[in-house]
């Protein structure tokens, strides 16, 4: 029975060239975080793993940094980074939760921050 | 061409513990995660755990935390594998994979021959 | 853990012929983290498809991998009769990595 949910910082925009964190966190459940997958659309960024520590993908290894926690902060942004992202925490034994941010990335230098929201 | 060559066959005692070595060549071992899985004769496929390429990281399956233990050699390129408090159920061949990337993708590309490890009283 | 169930168990062909086998994942393999692997009687698994559908490193193009999601098939367009073995998905999504049970292609 998967009790969890997902926080995450939701629907968010940021100014092209700066950067931003993408953070979920997992809550209502004592399950055991084993991986936490980071993917924009059906591309692997990031992987944090319990034993394993992190894995940046190259592609990605000059504009993402880990942390903090299991967050991540994606920087030297352009307008191509706009789109979804996904936090995948795979936990023992509940299974998978996914949450999802949509990112706006704003040629303007007014860039603000969505509101927090969750997914069951 | 990479390979990974592993220690003869075992035979053990319940309760025992065996040791089984994993050799590698042709590629630089300080690059690669390895695997290692084992296959109960006439069943299938199970992921025991993985090893980093410095042996500082380990991750190994519920099922076997705290029973197994992996750990490489740098100046030989073998990783090795111990299973601990052996019973009949553990009779079956472990292979040694190497991972396809520079981290634990998890897609084992290249295989050991296997070793195969019986336990009977 | 995600469990991984193949079918058919066996599948009885002849050389020349198309063989489909399937992989149903008991929840979904995001951004297709699975792989086919072929067994011969006596040796180790051989890597055949990643990424669902990524042919590995000197495997021939009549291994042919599709699906996501849940649901997977390996195609074997032609038969030949060094096919004929125990082919294993596996996906590497979720930890801990986990094999489906086989589908043996042989000889009709």
């Known amino acids: 029975m998967m009790t969890g949910t997902i926080e995450t910082t939701g629907n968010i925009s940021a100014e092209k060239g700066g950067s931003i964190i993408l953070q979920c966190h997992l809550s209502s459940t004592t399950a055991q975080v084993t991986q936490v997958n980071w993917e924009q659309q059906d591309q692997l960024l990031a992987i944090c793993n319990a034993d394993l520590g992190w894995h940046i993908s190259p592609s990605f290894k000059d504009r993402v940094a880990p942390g903090p926690g299991l967050g991540l902060t994606l920087q030297s942004l352009t307008v191509n980074d706009t789109g979804e992202y996904f936090c995948i925490y795979h936990t023992y034994p509940d299974g998978t939760y996914t949450g999802r941010i949509f990112l706006e990335v704003l040629e303007s230098s007014v860039a603000e921050h969505g509101a927090r929201f969750q997914i069951p | 061409q990479v390979q990974l060559v592993q220690s003869g066959a075992e035979v053990k005692k319940p309760g025992a513990s065996v040791k089984v070595s994993c050799k590698a060549s042709?590629?630089?071992?300080?690059?690669?995660?390895m695997h290692w899985v084992r296959q109960a004769p006439g069943q299938g496929l199970e992921w025991m755990g993985v090893?980093?390429?410095?042996?500082?990281?380990?991750s190994y399956a519920q099922k076997f935390q705290g029973r197994v233990t992996l750990t490489r050699d740098t100046s030989t390129s073998t990783v090795y594998m111990e299973l601990s408090s052996l019973r009949s159920e553990d009779t079956a061949v472990y292979y040694c994979?190497?991972?396809?990337?520079?981290?634990?993708?998890?897609?084992?590309?290249?295989w050991g021959q296997g070793t195969t490890v019986t336990v009977s009283s | 853990e995600i469990v991984l169930t193949q079918s058919p168990g066996t599948l009885s062909l002849s050389p020349g012929e198309r063989a489909t086998l399937s992989c149903r994942a008991s929840?979904?393999?995001?951004?297709?983290?699975l792989a086919w692997y072929q067994q011969k009687p006596g040796q180790a698994p051989r890597l055949l498809i990643y990424?669902?559908?990524s042919r590995a490193t000197g495997i021939p193009d009549r291994f042919s991998g599709s699906g996501s999601g849940t649901d997977f098939t390996l195609t074997i367009s032609r038969l030949e009769p060094e096919d004929f073995a125990v082919y294993y998905c596996?996906?590497?999504?979720?930890?801990?990595?986990?094999f489906g049970g086989g589908t043996k292609v042989e000889i009709k």
């Open positions: 994979a190497r991972d396809h990337s520079d981290y634990w993708s998890g897609i084992m590309e290249v």
């Open positions: 042709g590629y630089t071992f300080t690059s690669y995660y």
């Open positions: 090893i980093g390429p410095s042996g500082a990281s380990t």
């Open positions: 929840q979904s393999v995001r951004s297709s983290y």
């Open positions: 990424g669902a559908s």
């Open positions: 596996q996906q590497y999504f979720s930890p801990p990595w986990t």
